[in-house]
Amino acid sequence: DISEPPLHDFYCSRLLDLVFLLDGSSRLSEAEFEVLKAFVVDMMERLRISQKWVRVAVVEYHDGSHAYIGLKDRKRPSELRRIASQVKYAGSQVASTSEVLKYTLFQIFSKIDRPEASRIALLLMASQEPQRMSRNFVRYVQGLKKKKVIVIPVGIGPHANLKQIRLIEKQAPENKAFVLSSVDELEQQRDEIVSYLCDLAPEAPPPT
C-alpha cells in the first residue's frame, strides 16, 4: 500500500470511500472552478489516502460525468492530488446532478467491495439542472441510500439548487448539507466538512 507522511495536524485515518463530484457548469467561472479544485486538493491532503484507509474518486460532471480518479486507483496520494488539480474546466451550460448521482450509484458503487468502510459522495453543486433532467433525481438519491452511500451536498453560490439539496437532506439524517454563498467560503468551511466526513467513518478494527 502506497502511503506518504501526513501534511497536516488533522489527518483522517478511517475506513472511508469518498467521491468528490465537481460541478462543471459555467455558473462557476474558470477562476472559481480553480478555487473548487484547490479545495478538493486541500481536503485530500487531510485524508490518509490508501487502498486500506481512505479511497478517493474524483468526478467532474456536466451533462455527463468524467471520472479523473477511481476508488481502486493505486497511486501515491501526491500523484492523486496532482491529477485532481488537473481536472479540466468544462464551463458547460448544464451540470446534471441527476446524471452524476446515477453515475455514482451504477458505476462507482455498483459493487460494494469494502462493506466495512463508509461510503460518502461529496456533491459540490453551483447550478440547477433543467427540470426534464431531474425526473429520476429522488430515485437515484434513494438508490444511494439503499447502498448506504451518504450524500453530502455543498451548495455554492446563488444558483445552487436548494430544492435538490433539501431533498437529499430529507432522505437520511447523515446527509448534512453545507450551503455557501461563494467559493470564497470553501476554505473556511473545509475543516468542518473534513471533520464531519471523518466522524461518519469507522476506525479500523484492532489487529487480531
Epitope: 467561472s29 480553480e34 479544485k37 484547490a38 496532482r82 488539480s85 488537473q86 464551463g91
Partner: nanobody
Framework: QVQLVESGGGLVQAGGSLRLSCAAS?????MAWFRQPPGKEREFVAV????????LVAASVKGRFTISRDNAKNTVYLQMTSLKPADTAVYYC??????????????????WGQGTQVTVSS
Amino acid sequence: QVQLVESGGGLVQAGGSLRLSCAASGRTKDMAWFRQPPGKEREFVAVIYSSDGSTLVAASVKGRFTISRDNAKNTVYLQMTSLKPADTAVYYCATSRGYSGTYYSTSRYDYWGQGTQVTVSS
C-alpha cells in the same frame, strides 16, 4: 516555448500606484503574477484565465491590486494601488502549459519572466 517579459517596476512612495505589464511571445491560457519579497519565498498575487477572463487575487492584495489582460496584444497587466512598504518585492509573470498543481503554487507554472523590481518607500 513561451517567453515572458515584464516591465513597469520602479520606486514609488507609499500610497502610490504602479502598473506592471507582461508581454507573452505566444498564446497562453492562464497568466499569473507572483512576487518575492527580500529574503522570503515567492508568493501568489493574482491570476487571469483566457477562457472567460475570470480572475483570482490573493487576499493580502484584494481591493488594491487588479489583474487584466489584452488578448490582442498577448499582454497581462497588474494594476497596483495604495502601495505599502510590505509590497516591496521582485514581481514575476508566469504561465503554464497544462493545469498541474493548484493555481497559487509555483510548481504549476512552466514559464517565468525575469522579474521586475518594485520598491515602495515610506
